[in-house]
């Protein structure tokens, strides 16, 4: 029986060039986290983080994906089109999958402010 | 054309070490994952482990750690794999292979270095 | 270490049959298996990832399915090139592992 639930950022806004911070969260659960897969909006993969093999980027992204904080990701170098959702798949053991959604806007404004809060979704 | 081209054939006495290297071309080397592979004659695959150019992070399979040491210079775009305190449970062909797109698999592989490890 | 179980070890059969491998891992990887083809005295190529996505510039009579545990690959009428060994390989965890191998030859 799957118990747990996925934390994540929510709904999150960022300046253009600058950088966020994409974090899930897994809790009330005391399954074994073996991969964390995050993809975009078009399914596309960004990242993966794997317990044992480390870390994979997707290499069209080496250069501007970082790895961290944590099982978390941090997206560099924003574009406009980087506007729009991600997810963050949990591979457990022995629960199964979990999945969490988190949408970036990414604004042009210099006034744009980084909010980032901890939502369930 | 996405290429690796790795270094000729080794004869070498047990005991001793020896170097082999893989150069790739026709992408970008800092942004793929380079694996290397064992295969013995006639038998199956065995993965070593694989060298991150863009940090030089490296991941190994346990059974080779203190046998084999990867490294890669991105100069060059060359990946390096050292083998050290050879038996003749070392001869085999060695192959070193790009990492896939989407995770730890094998898309572009090298024409493989044989090592034959006699006194 | 994740044991990859690949079957029949050998295989026979003509030009224009369907063949199918099977590859079956003893927990489970979701969908993170590869096949590769390797012919004699050559290097592997990818065929398939992620149990069933189809390598670039493969064609399109192989076709892998499956997850968890259970894995197939499937070749429609067979071509005189499609001969060789097909190995399957796990990518979710360390070590990764292959198959030992089934072996396609020419009835």
């Known amino acids: 029986m799957m118990t747990g639930t996925i934390e994540t950022t929510g709904n999150i806004s960022a300046k253009k060039g600058g950088s966020v911070i994409l974090q899930c969260h897994l809790s009330s659960t005391m399954a074994q986290v073996t991969q964390v897969n995050w993809e975009q909006h078009d399914h596309s993969l960004l990242a993966i983080r794997n317990a044992e093999l480390g870390w994979h980027i997707y290499p069209a992204f080496k250069d501007r994906v970082a790895p961290g904080p944590g099982l978390g990701l941090t997206l560099q170098s924003l574009t406009m089109n980087d506007t729009g959702e991600y997810f963050c798949t949990y591979h457990t053991y022995p629960d199964g999958t979990y999945r969490g959604r988190i949408f970036l806007e990414v604004l042009e404004s210099s006034v744009a402010e980084h909010s980032a809060r901890f939502q369930i979704p | 054309e996405v290429q690796l081209q790795q270094s000729g054939p080794e004869l070498v006495k047990p005991g001793a070490s020896m170097k082999m290297s893989c150069k790739a071309s026709?992408?970008?080397?800092?942004?793929?994952?380079m694996h290397w592979v064992k295969q013995k004659p006639g038998q199956g695959l065995e993965w070593i482990g694989y060298?991150?150019?863009?940090?030089?992070?490296?991941k190994y399979n346990e059974k080779f750690k203190g046998k084999a040491t990867l490294t890669s210079d991105k100069s060059s775009s060359i990946a390096y794999m050292e083998l050290s305190s050879l038996t003749s449970e070392d001869s085999a062909v060695f192959y070193c292979?790009?990492?896939?797109?989407?995770?730890?698999?094998?898309?572009?592989w090298g024409a493989g270095t044989t090592v034959t490890v006699s006194s | 270490d994740i044991q990859m179980t690949q079957s029949p070890a050998s295989l026979s059969a003509s030009v224009g049959e369907t063949v199918t491998f099977t590859c079956r891992t003893n927990?489970?990887?979701?969908?993170?298996l590869t096949w590769y083809q390797q012919k004699q005295g050559k290097s592997p190529q990818v065929l398939v990832y992620n149990a069933k996505t189809l390598a670039e510039g493969v064609p399109s009579r192989f076709s892998g399915s499956g997850s968890g545990t259970q894995f197939s690959l499937k070749i429609n009428s067979l071509q005189p090139e499609d001969f060789g060994s097909y190995f399957c390989q796990h990518h979710f965890g360390n070590p990764l592992t292959f198959g030992a191998g089934t072996k396609l030859e020419l009835k």
């Open positions: 026709g992408y970008k080397f800092t942004s793929y994952v």
């Open positions: 927990e489970n990887i979701y969908s993170y």
């Open positions: 292979a790009r990492g896939g797109s989407r995770g730890w698999y094998f898309d572009v």
């Open positions: 060298i991150d150019p863009y940090n030089d992070g490296s």
